[in-house]
């Protein structure tokens, strides 16, 4: 197993609507054609797994048809959006990329993206 | 357990076909790259191919390239080797072959093996 | 012709040290692939041994260790026993063959 740099963004802020987007960057090494991609989330010193996909270089990213994330690949970068968010999702969310095939085999993880939800304030009653 | 099961060995005729499937359990099996390994009697391994966790790259050794046809069915668990105008050199056991996570560049798991001879 | 070069027999007595080389090219170990080493015993899958040119995994004593330079390897098995005694096969990564590569096998005899 091979080191890897990753960098991503330090800060980022969820939409209202609960979306937050950042760009996941890998110095690749090596000549890589299929890329693992996994955004962890610390909270509490806990760690879960978020979503994960697996794409080929120069093709889309595939999340599964239920995941929270979606993205875009371009060269070495990753354009990660992760929707659904609220107040208590608010985090660290990690990057770990690893180069899969062919050898050798590379792991990177980023420092993390601490993003902060806040929930929209309701709409107060109208009377007319 | 991690397990890899391969199948579909047997005796066939010079220029005949054969695909050997090789059932895998245990582990992730979509994440990783697997791998044909075959060993003729008496002699070394030789690597014969791999294909990538999604199928999408696909190497061959020299010695079997445009002849066999690696594939992989991660719905299934399955990894097959589709051997075609089969000649005596191919005589060897197959084990299809992998690796554990962390571990990802050396084989730590490989099947029990599947002998295929080439005789008339 | 194996790609990588392994002397075919080595042998020792028990409580031995024995060195099993593995010489490869630019392309393979010369190129910064880490080499693996395989131990298969009479009738069996072979079983991985150390990889990443020197790391073992669980299970295997610390008796056998391993180490890479440049364009060759070697594997070393110190204080021999009459178990140890197999087939041992360096592989690497092949850049210009796009597959891996074995070595052609060393018979391990303990004498």
């Known amino acids: 197993c091979k080191a890897m740099h990753v960098a991503q963004p330090a800060v980022v802020l969820a939409s209202s609507r609960g979306i937050a987007s950042f760009v996941c960057e890998y110095a690749s090494p090596g000549k890589a054609t299929e890329v693992r991609v996994t955004v962890l989330r610390q909270a509490d010193s806990q760690v879960t797994e978020v979503c994960a996909a697996t794409y080929m270089m120069g093709n889309e990213l595939t999340f599964l048809d239920d995941s929270i994330c979606t993205g875009t690949s371009s060269g070495n970068q990753v354009n990660l959006t992760i929707q659904g968010l609220r107040a208590m999702d608010t985090g660290l969310y990690i990057c770990k990329v690893e180069l899969m095939y062919p050898p050798p085999y590379y792991l990177g993880i980023g420092n993390g993206t601490q993003i902060y939800v806040i929930d929209p304030e309701p709409c107060p009653d109208s009377d007319f | 357990e991690v397990q890899l099961l391969e199948s579909g060995g047997g005796l066939v005729q010079p220029g005949g076909s054969l695909r050997l499937s090789c059932a895998a359990s245990g582990f992730t099996f979509s994440s990783y790259a697997m791998s044909w390994v075959r060993q003729a009697p008496g002699k070394g391994l030789e690597w014969v191919s791999g294909?990538?966790?999604?199928?999408?790259?696909?190497h061959y050794a020299d010695s079997v390239k445009g002849r066999f046809t690696i594939s992989r069915d991660n719905s299934k668990n399955t990894l097959y080797l589709q051997m075609n105008s089969l000649r005596a050199e191919d005589t060897a056991v197959y084990y299809c072959a992998t690796y554990s996570s962390g571990l990802h560049d050396a084989f730590d798991i490989w099947g029990q093996g599947t002998l295929v001879t080439v005789s008339s | 012709q194996s790609v990588l070069t392994q002397p075919p027999s080595a042998s020792g007595t028990p409580g031995q040290r024995v060195t099993i080389s593995c010489t490869g090219s630019?392309?393979?170990?010369?190129?910064?692939?880490?080499v693996h080493w395989y131990q298969q015993l009479p009738g069996t899958a072979p079983k991985l041994l150390i990889y990443d040119n020197n790391k073992r995994p669980s299970g295997v004593p610390d008796r056998f260790s391993g180490s890479k330079s440049g364009t060759s390897a070697s594997l070393a098995i110190s204080g021999l026993r009459s178990e140890d005694e197999a087939d041992y096969y360096c592989?690497?990564?092949?850049?210009?063959?796009?597959?891996?590569?074995f070595g052609g096998g060393t018979k391990l005899t303990v004498l």
């Open positions: 592989a690497a990564w092949d850049d210009s063959l796009n597959g891996w590569v």
């Open positions: 294909i990538s966790g999604s199928g999408g790259y696909i």
């Open positions: 630019s392309s393979n170990i010369g190129a910064g692939y880490d």
